[in-house]
């Protein structure tokens, strides 16, 4: 299981990659099929990790959720699946695409209008701790004084990227998810070789900013497959 993977000491040390996600010291570059993660400032990998592409939603991209690929399939085999659009069936918030949430088994829009007079507990308690400043989510007791909160700033706990301020995304960080900066041109990014190969990134990076894509750095073409460095580059 991923638990045993994470807690395993049968790992090899690797030098840290060049740069970090928006300067974060512990932003490992996933080199599928291995898993990279930092232990302190020591980067480590577990080779040939295949069995479980994901174990929870946090490992997947912002437009994905973690689930069994087939209905009634083996619950142990889960991969990152594309998020569900508005009016599609769902079982939890993470299944719905950004800007939507799961209500009564259906993905519905989470724009502010939907919340006026309709603040339900599954939303308010899932997202509504005031300090994490999630837009439009508020406890019943604070409705009169504070209907809307500002978006989460860098370092704030979040559940998805729409909880974070402009220029930030919601990314895995240890056993939580926090708002981190969207990557700028030239910054190291994580390129997932295929859907579901996200692996375990303790310090997950954000995606590249608008007009940028995560591509192999020119001078790294000669490097071996597993150590190619990807950076955010103009289209």
């Amino acid at each position: 299981t991923l638990n045993s993977v994470l807690n395993s000491n049968a790992i090899k040390n690797l030098p840290p990659p060049l740069g970090g996600a928006a300067g974060h010291p512990g932003s490992a570059v996933s080199a599928a099929p291995g898993i990279l993660y930092p232990g302190g400032n020591k980067y480590q990998t577990i080779d040939n990790y295949q069995p479980y592409p994901c174990a929870e939603d946090e490992e997947c991209g912002t437009d994905e959720y973690c689930a069994s690929p087939t209905r009634g399939g083996d619950a142990g085999v889960q991969i990152c699946l594309a998020c569900r659009k508005r009016r599609k069936r769902c079982m939890r918030h993470a299944m719905c695409c950004p800007g939507n949430y799961c209500k009564n088994g259906i993905c519905v829009s989470s724009d502010q209008n939907n919340f006026r007079g309709e603040i339900e507990e599954t939303i308010t308690e899932s997202f509504g701790n005031d300090h994490s400043t999630l837009d439009g989510y508020s406890r019943r007791t604070t409705l009169s004084s504070k209907m809307y909160h500002s978006k989460g700033q860098e370092g704030s706990v979040c559940l998805r990227s729409s909880d974070c301020a402009t220029g930030l995304c919601c990314a895995r960080h240890f056993w939580s998810k926090i708002c981190k900066p969207v990557l700028k041109e030239g910054q190291v990014c994580t390129k997932h070789r295929r859907k579901g190969s996200h692996g375990l990134e303790i310090f997950q990076r954000c995606y590249c900013g608008e007009g940028l894509s995560c591509r192999i750095q020119k001078d790294h073409h000669q490097a071996s497959n597993s150590s190619r460095l990807h950076t955010c580059q103009r289209h």
Partner: antibody, heavy 115, light 108 residues
């Protein structure tokens, strides 16, 4: 409102075991990572362990690795810390707290390891 | 491990005075993944600041956090009687999570 209530502390001999529990209420438990922090008498705070919302990922301080096990039962909204091979230096008040910066804390439960 | 050193160890001030508490990291934190807590005797800690400068729910405006890199500061603009306590900083940017040793703010 958010509430965290620890239990299970007490006096135990060196080498013994204890299981701490933390009952959570007032929020959607499985959406949040949880943390154990301890404080030895008259000392500062020390991070002990953390667990992700689904329970898939667990993290430990070097001082407790291999002896302590963090777990959670999301159906019961409860966080656990199984402590084995206890040492005198594990004597402390143990707090459960929510998420990575601890926005809500329990009142703490005292664990005393002594012969 | 990132070591957080808080100074001074004890700060003796009078109500109404300004308190400036320092937290210095042994390595660059790169990102503002730093929190501040207040703890009174016999009580659990209380979150004051997260993300280096964001005030937690219900925390009075007299508390503010600032800093980046290796140097972070908690400022209490005008001390109230209930502010006399021990304050801890905590970094959550790198593994393992670490706390400073604390600064005790006492009445002069």
């Amino acid at each position: 409102q958010v509430q965290l209530v620890e239990s299970g502390g007490g006096l135990v001999q060196p080498g013994g075991s204890l299981r701490l529990s933390c009952a959570a209420s007032g929020f959607t438990f499985n959406n949040y990572g949880m943390t154990w922090v301890r404080q030895a008498p008259g000392k500062g705070l020390e991070w002990v362990s953390g667990i992700s919302g689904s329970g898939s990922y667990t993290y430990y301080a070097d001082s407790v690795k291999g002896r302590f096990t963090i777990s959670r039962d999301n159906s019961k909204n409860t966080l656990y810390l199984q402590m084995n091979s206890l040492r005198a230096e594990d004597t402390a008040v143990y707090y459960c707290a929510r998420t990575i910066y601890m926005d809500y804390w329990g009142q703490g439960t005292l664990v005393t390891v002594s012969s | 491990d990132i070591v957080l050193t808080q100074s001074p160890a004890t700060l003796s001030l009078s109500p109404g005075e300004r308190a400036t508490l320092s937290c210095r990291a042994s390595q660059n934190l790169f990102s503002p993944y730093l929190a501040w807590y207040q703890q009174k005797p016999g009580q659990a800690p209380r979150l004051l600041i997260y993300g280096a400068s964001n005030r937690a729910t219900g925390v009075p405006a007299r508390f503010s956090g600032s800093g980046s890199g290796t140097d972070f500061t908690l400022t209490i603009s005008s001390l109230e009687p209930e502010d006399f306590a021990t304050y801890y900083c905590q970094q959550y940017g790198d593994e393992p999570i670490t706390f400073g040793q604390g600064t005790k703010v006492e009445i002069k």
